[in-house]
């Protein structure tokens, strides 16, 4: 089939980095500057992605592959192929309409991205709190209270609400 197709369609012989130029009797022409074709047989070359603003160039465009972007410091990539950049926050914070805000009591965020999420409720698994949670770290659950040897005690902080709320603006 491929052989038949190449006999019928001269464009199928054009390799990556070229395009089948209809204006020049279907000759394989190199992609113009700032464009590429990553597969053979293409009738046009695609425009190279430009990494501008909060995007920076991770890999330059070539005649056979698109440019790749990442984000400038203080931002992180979102989307397939880093199609978006979003502002970083500090650990223990989340991004809101008013910028980076500290996690509310009973919630934490151990990354510079994402949202504050509730501490693990150790008692749901029949365990006790071994290490208290903070804005940056989840609680650490230990053995169940019944498993503790006599005289031993576990840290018992105020239990966060089952569904921690957020303080008003």
């Amino acid at each position: 089939f491929e052989r038949t197709r190449s006999l019928q369609d001269p464009c199928s012989n054009c390799p990556a980095g070229t395009f089948c130029d209809n204006n020049r009797n279907q000759i394989c022409s190199p992609c113009p500057p700032n464009s590429f074709s990553s597969a053979g047989g293409q009738r046009t070359c695609d425009i190279c992605r430009q990494c501008k603003g909060v995007f920076r160039t991770r890999k330059e465009c070539s005649s056979t592959s698109n440019a790749e972007c990442d984000c400038t410091p203080g931002f992180h990539c979102l989307g397939a192929g880093c199609s978006m950049c979003e502002q970083d926050c500090k650990q223990g914070q989340e991004l809101t309409k008013k910028g980076c805000k500290d996690c509310c009591f009973g919630t934490f965020n151990d990354q510079k991205r994402g949202i504050c999420r509730p501490w693990t409720n150790c008692s749901l698994d029949g365990k006790s709190v071994l290490v208290n949670g903070t804005k940056e770290r989840d609680v650490v659950c230990g053995p169940s209270p019944a498993d503790l040897s006599p005289g031993a005690s576990s840290v018992t902080p105020p239990a966060p609400a089952r569904e921690p709320g957020h303080s008003p603006q």
């Epitope: 979102l78 989307g79 397939a80 199609s83 978006m84 979003e86 989340e94 991004l95 809101t96 309409k97 509310c104 919630t107 990354q111 991205r113 994402g114 949202i115 504050c116 999420r117 509730p118 693990t120 569904e163 921690p164 709320g165 957020h166 603006q169």
Partner: antibody, heavy 117, light 108 residues
Amino acid sequence: QVQLQESGPGPVKPSETLSLTCAVSGGSISSSHWWSWVRQPPGKGLEWIGEIYHSGRTYYNPSLKSRVTISVDTSRNQFSLKLSSVTAADTAVYYCAREDGGIMDVWGQGTLVTVSS
Amino acid sequence: SSELTQDPAVSVALGQTVRITCQGDSLRRFYASWYQQKPGQAPVLVIYGKNNRPSGIPDRFSASDSGNTASLTITGAQAEDEADYYCSSRDRSGYRWVFGGGTKVTVL
């Protein structure tokens, strides 16, 4: 770049358990993202089912929580959905998606699951 | 009853401007994300954050918000913009997600 692909056994009978898997390619499921399931009944809107982190931590839609289990297999770079005691109302296109700060930035193409006897 | 409310349908003449709204308490604190979905296809993110577009999304799509209402505006609507549009944000818990009911945009 990251791509997601849902797969499952096809039609499910009422009262049985629906099982779907989402394969992650072009990136690691152990990245700093959460991995979600979203469904869409025919002709209706999107409904978030739940999500999982590579550590196994999960959050579920309260309306489905009693029937949903989401699990992760980091060695296979995939995560799975189980929905028990299904009825015709669970007939939907099921999507897996990557979630980051509430933004579903990468989606699978979706798979239709029909619940019918 | 969704925690994010959208009008079910709007229509717009080709080349004109259309505005879709999304209301919900969580939008006082957090931005909505907006998704476009065409028949038989998966949703595609078109706006996130205050007014940010993923690369490849035309600049005729923009967002704004006021209080508990987020808006998506298509300025100079094209035939290919005919689709369902969904807003999304957090639910009351603050750490789970919810979608609006969707708005069907018809380009006349």
